[in-house]
Each structure stands twice: as C-alpha cells, then as structure tokens.
Interface confidence: medium
C-alpha cells in the first residue's frame, strides 16, 4: 500500500516567503475536518444539479492576526491564533 502522510493539524507555522531573521511571519497552515453525508431531500429540491452526497469542510484560518510590513514594501497578515472555520478561499 502507498504511504499515507497525515496532514498536520491546523497550527501557526512560519511563512519563509515573508519572514526575516528575527522577525518571523506566522500563518495558519494545516488541515481541518471534513465530513460527507447523504443530501437531505429538502436540500435536494433546491439544487439546480442534484447531488446525492453533501460534503462539509472547514479551513485552517486565522482567528486573530496583525498586519505587518515586510521587506518589499507591503503589508501581510501575521497570524496570532488559528482555528478551523469557514473557507474563504477556493481554488477555481
């Protein structure tokens, strides 16, 4: 069987792209739970394209953050706490 690498839990991790020596930029990274269940009939009725299975997921996002200036001349979010919550960003 192929190796399965567990996804690390949602925690603060250093973002090397923006970090400077002595001034780390921390951002929330990792995985959150997702679950799938049969789509309730009442929900099916409202769907344009009906799906038998509904999946529900949360994303690793910042619970709190500060905006800080990084070299290169712009602001980034320096996360101070993480939680699994609403997914704001979706890949198209």
């Amino acid at each position: 069987a192929p190796d399965v690498q567990d996804c690390p839990e949602c925690t603060l991790q250093e973002n090397p792209f923006f970090s400077q020596p002595g001034a780390p930029i921390l951002q929330c990274m990792g995985c959150c739970f997702s679950r799938a269940y049969p789509t309730p009939l009442r929900s099916k009725k409202t769907m344009l394209v009906q799906k038998n299975v509904t999946s529900e997921s949360t994303c690793c996002v910042a619970k709190s953050y500060n905006r800080v200036t990084v070299m290169g001349g712009f602001k980034v979010e320096n996360h101070t706490a993480c939680h699994c919550s609403t997914c704001y960003y979706h890949k198209s």
């Epitope: 970090s19 400077q20 020596p21 905006r67 070299m71 290169g72 001349g73 712009f74 602001k75």
Partner: antibody, heavy 113, light 111 residues
Framework: QVQLQQSGAELMKPGASVKLTASCSGF??????MHWVKQRPEQGLEWIGR????????KYDPKFQGKATITADTSSNTAYLQLSSLTSEDTAVYYC?????????WGQGTTVT | DIQGTQSPASLVVSLGQRATISCRAS??????????VNWYQQKPGQPPKLLIY???NLESGVPARFSGSGSGTDFTLNIHPVEEEDAATYYC?????????FGAGTKLEIS
C-alpha cells in the same frame, strides 16, 4: 474585482495646486499601501511616495517632498495626491498604484498639463 | 537611494528570437534569500504591468516566455521567443528599501 479609478485630466495654470483622486474598489485600502508614480511625456517612471491609509503615515522620495502631499480617506476607500506650486515640470501622467507581489494593480492614470 | 541602471536603452529583436535586458543596482538588493527586483512592461497610453517579482517569480497570467534571473546587484529579464505583442518599454524596479526607484527603461521593438 480590484479597481483603482482615477479622476479625469486636469489643465492647470502655473503656480496653482491640483488634487488627484483614486477611488478604490474590490479591496480595503486600510489593508495595503497606496503609492503614487509620476511619468513625464516620453519619460520613465518616478516613485513619488506612499501612504499607509490605516494610520495616515506617508513616505516620499525626497525630490517630491514639499511638492506632493498624499492623503487617504478610508471611509470612501479613496487615495489622493495633491501637487502644489505647479510648473511645466509637473506636466505628466500620475498613476495610483497598489503594489503587492502577485497582486499588483494600477489606476489608469491622470494627465496633468 | 538605490539606483537602477538599465541597458540597453533600446533593442530591436527579430520575431521568435531572444530579448535580453539588464538592470544593475547601485548596491545589493538581495536579503534573506530574496532579491527585491521587479520587472514591468508598459505599452503607450497604458499603466505599467508587473511581469516578474522578486527577481524570478512570474506574475499570474504572464506568459512563460518571460523570465527573470539574478541576485545581488545584477539582474536580467529574458523574453524568448519574442512575439509581436511584446513590443513595449520594460522597466526594472527595486523594492529593497524606500524610496522605490525604477530603471530608465528599455524600449523593445520587434522586426
């Protein structure tokens, strides 16, 4: 989507002042810096300065100190560039610029003559 | 202030060939493993468009025929193969510290 809509062309008299406007949409100016860049006819790009709209802090290229004043109004999500004591040297296109790696946006430019 | 010296001032390249533009900073613009040089393309009557950031990173939506390289004080923008739509003026910019400065520009013509 992100847009920086600049005010229209200005025809000015020597010695006058002008205030250029950049109305921003699709993002909050508080979350970024707003830069202004000058381009004289058939010339290159010159960085004038920037503002941190979250607190009003400004930084200027020394050569524009006293000539340019950058302000911002977070309630209307608008950045401003005021130019004073206008001379022929100030004839140029002025661009508002949201400078961020991989999220770089410019206004369409305002011509001041 | 960090000054950027761009060369050549103008360049004529045949369709499908390689265009190479150089930018030399008056002092190092590299720090912590990154080089704070960006490349812009500008066509007449339009604002500049970011092509390359941090010396070698391609901005989203920019064709892969554009590439950037270099570190310290010496940087290069390559376009290969050159297409007709690449006729424009190209500027390097450093963002290592304030004030930000641009190179004088290189006008690229396609023959």
């Amino acid at each position: 989507q992100v847009q920086l809509q600049q005010s229209g062309a200005e025809l000015m008299k020597p010695g006058a002042s002008v205030k250029l406007t950049a109305s921003c949409s699709g993002f909050s100016i508080k979350d970024t810096y707003m830069h202004w860049v000058k381009q004289r006819p058939e010339q290159g790009l010159e960085w004038i300065g920037r503002i941190d709209p979250a607190n009003g802090n400004t930084k200027y290229d020394p050569k524009f100190q006293g000539k340019a004043t950058i302000t911002a109004d977070t309630s209307s999500n608008t950045a401003y560039l005021q130019l004073s004591s206008l001379t022929s040297e100030d004839t140029a296109v002025y661009y508002c610029h949201r400078f961020e790696f991989a999220m770089d946006y410019w206004g369409q430019g305002t011509t001041v003559t | 202030d960090i000054q950027g010296t761009q060369s050549p001032a103008s360049l004529v390249v045949s369709l499908g060939q390689r265009a190479t533009i150089s930018c030399r900073a008056s002092k190092s613009v590299s720090a912590s493993g990154y080089s704070y040089v960006n490349w812009y393309q500008q066509k007449p009557g339009q604002p500049p468009k970011l092509l390359i950031y941090l010396a070698s990173n391609l901005e989203s939506g920019v064709p892969a025929r554009f590439s950037g390289s270099g570190s310290g004080t010496d940087f290069t923008l390559n376009i290969h193969p050159v297409e007709e739509e690449d006729a424009a003026t190209y500027y390097c910019q450093h963002s290592r510290e304030l004030p930000l400065t641009f190179g004088a520009g290189t006008k690229l013509e396609i023959s």
